[in-house]
């Protein structure tokens, strides 16, 4: 295999325990997507992570072991973006209202929404419990982290001709080897302390000239705020 290493996410590393306190796991009997806690009662995830019933798991590190810091809260409302397109994955964003407020502490805390769009070259942190193998499958129990740069929109569009909308951007490495993968969807891309991206899609994982594609959260700040206000 081209990237046959002891990869995490793919090509990342084990996050320090509870070092990504805004990261949540979406569970429907199994972990299927990630998400980000943006206030005590709301989580941002990907539109294609929609399910009718979701349990949000906060304070997780090892998702197969009860470690004592977890908060399991059922979703009260699941609101996919009204213009979500499952064929193109445009507007791939979703809000989840928790049935009760999360208890904010050192291991469970919120992440800020962006105040400006992501700048090319900015180093970001991507995290999740997704597949760690670029071919085949190997799902980790412990949260994985990856540091990766924002790519220019030109490089992003060149990697996926005709598929990149203004609501998407690329993060990663054109040489391959490091990327988010299946199971990471909905999870955070945090740059300079702001939630700039939501893990969305890609052509395989960690393949050369096929970087990860992420929902541009900046474009949805108004929708997020309006939706929260209308459902509080």
């Amino acid at each position: 295999a081209p990237f046959d290493d002891d990869d995490k996410i793919v090509g990342g590393y084990n996050c320090e325990e509870n070092s990504v306190p805004y990261q949540v796991s979406l569970n429907s009997g199994y972990h299927f997507c990630g998400g980000s806690l943006i206030n005590e009662q709301w989580v941002v995830s990907a539109g294609h992570c929609y399910k009718s019933r979701i349990q949000v798991r906060l304070g997780e590190h090892n998702i197969e072991v009860l470690e004592g810091n977890e908060q399991f809260i059922n979703a009260a409302k699941i609101i996919r973006h009204p213009q979500y397109d499952r064929k193109t994955l445009n507007n791939d964003i979703m809000l989840i209202k928790l049935s009760s407020r999360a208890v904010i502490n050192a291991r469970v805390s919120t992440i800020s929404l962006p105040t400006a769009p992501p700048a090319t070259g900015t180093k970001c942190l991507i995290s999740g419990w997704g597949n760690t193998a670029s071919s085949g499958a190997d799902y980790p129990d412990e949260l994985q982290c990856l540091d990766a740069p924002v790519l220019s929109q030109a490089k992003c569009e060149a990697s996926y001709p005709g598929k990149i909308t203004s609501n998407m951007f690329c993060v990663g490495f054109l040489e391959g080897g490091k990327d988010s993968c299946q199971g990471d969807s909905g999870g955070p891309v945090v740059c300079n302390g702001q939630l700039q991206g939501v893990v969305s899609w890609g052509d395989g994982c960690a393949q050369k000239n096929k970087p990860g594609v992420y929902t541009k959260v900046y474009n949805y700040v108004k929708w997020i705020k309006n939706t929260i206000a209308a459902n509080s």
């Epitope: 299927f32 019933r53 129990d141």
Partner: antibody, heavy 126, light 106 residues
């Protein structure tokens, strides 16, 4: 091509534990999710649960208290144990491979079960 | 649990007829819906995944549609080899199957 074969006792006494094994041939058990499904004679299908090759499981909530699944990658096998059986557990038991992660989205998605064993009949009777 | 209600429970049609089976979920399951064919004494066979996608090798006379709570499975031109019981199955939360529809030839 991948083939599945269920094996185990065809007769189990009430209150005992039903144990079945599914052997995967023609391909590796690794990197897949695997399910158990049962079907009482003349009735519909009931999903029992699924296991990933790491050993991670999820079970049908109505059976969860009685079900244990395990996997042995070295033997290319996965197993089902169902405790405290009654006559209601009499059925044809199938093992199957879960089809997962088509397309480009990076969620964990399942798309049905694409490879099945031929099934094994288990009768619970004293 | 999400309940899957299939109808009709049985039907009889002539060779060449268009056959339609419906499946209703007790709550929104998006497109997390698959269809199977089971012939007597055999294991089920996956025909349609994700509500409308034809599994590899399955004849094009089989099709599926729907999203949310209401789904339809269609055989555009019934063939003798299509005699079987057909099941819908959801995978939105855990897995549940519909009760099945037995298809017979008139």
């Amino acid at each position: 091509q991948v083939q599945l074969q269920e094996s185990g006792p065809g007769l189990v006494k009430p209150s005992e534990t039903l144990s079945l094994t599914c052997t995967v041939s023609g391909g590796s058990i690794s990197s897949y999710y695997w399910s158990w499904i049962r079907q009482p004679a003349g009735k519909g299908l009931e999903w029992i649960g699924r296991i990933y090759t790491s050993g991670s499981t999820n079970y049908n909530p109505s059976l969860k208290s009685r079900v244990t699944m395990s996997v042995d990658t070295s033997k290319n096998q996965f197993s089902l144990k169902l405790s405290s059986v009654t006559a209601a557990d009499t059925a044809v038991y199938y093992c199957a491979r879960d089809l997962t992660n088509y397309g480009s989205g990076k969620s964990i998605r399942f798309y049905g079960m694409d490879v099945w064993g031929q099934g094994t009949t288990v009768t619970v009777s004293s | 649990d999400i309940q899957m209600t299939q109808s009709p429970s049985s039907l009889s049609a002539s060779v060449g007829d268009r056959v339609t089976i419906t499946c209703q979920a007790s709550q929104d399951i998006s497109n997390y819906l698959n269809w199977y064919q089971q012939k007597p004494g055999k294991a089920p066979k996956l025909l349609i995944y994700d509500a409308s996608n034809l599994e590899t090798g399955v004849p094009s006379r089989f099709s599926g549609s729907g999203s949310g709570t209401d789904f339809t499975f269609t055989i555009s031109s019934l063939q003798p080899e299509d005699i079987a019981t057909y099941y819908c199955q959801q995978d939105d939360n855990f897995i549940t199957f519909g009760g099945g529809t037995k298809v017979e030839i008139k």
